[in-house]
Amino acid sequence: MNGRVDYLVTEEEINLTRGPSGLGFNIVGGTDQQYVSNDSGIYVSRIKENGAAALDGRLQEGDKILSVNGQDLKNLLHQDAVDLFRNAGYAVSLRVQHRLQVQNGPIGHRGEGDPSG
């Protein structure tokens, strides 16, 4: 019997300092370029090697970026989001949503968690 796939969703504030090649990641998404079906959010498509995001280590490919310096990224055209990042300044605060895939075992199976008592 196969286990079902669940997702653990967490949010994190990530502060990056712009490097010589920018923030060091690419984005996809927007109201005119949906990356996820029925979701016009902005997602990280690629982390550039040795860029600011890679060196920080917290931002991951597939993360959803919720805001930049407090500016909500809901319902933006793709290029509007790109330009927000481009003009965000030297110190950039990102609110991101990580979506971690959790593989649950078959029903009745208990993983090696903490003792229940």
Epitope: D32, L76, H78, Q79, D80, D83, N87
Partner: nanobody, 124 residues
């Protein structure tokens, strides 16, 4: 893909009027500007309007004769030109600020990241 398409140019007699339009797609909430370039001359600032439409500035050579406006529902900017003179003959370009919801409008050509192909205005 960002596109700015100007229309409304043409041949007009001195003293006449024209209304130029600039339809924008691919970006929104941008300060918008109009510039012009006459043959053999540098590109010159004409007018600019804030992304909310509440603030405008004009170049000295056209002040009092042109009005810039916008319709955000249509993502379109307009340039109403009156009392046209032969020296207004030029290619008129529409431009969008490179910054999303930028705070201050400017006549600085360098801040305008997106440009249309231009529309010819000839005043005889």
């Amino acid at each position: 893909h960002v596109q700015l398409v100007e229309s409304g140019g043409g041949l007009v007699q001195a003293g006449g009027s024209l209304r130029l339009s600039c339809a924008v797609s691919g970006v929104s909430f941008r300060n918008m500007g109009w510039f012009r370039q006459a043959p053999g001359k540098e590109r010159e600032f004409v007018a600019a309007i804030s992304w909310g439409g509440d603030s405008t500035i004009y170049g000295d050579s056209v002040k009092g004769r042109v009005t810039i406006s916008r319709d955000n529902a249509k993502n379109t900017a307009y340039l109403e030109m009156n009392s046209l003179k032969p020296e207004d003959t030029a290619v008129y370009y529409c431009a969008a600020d490179g910054r999303f919801r930028a705070g201050r409008i400017s006549s600085d050509l360098g801040l305008y990241h997106y440009w249309g192909q231009g529309t010819q205005v000839t005043v005889s």
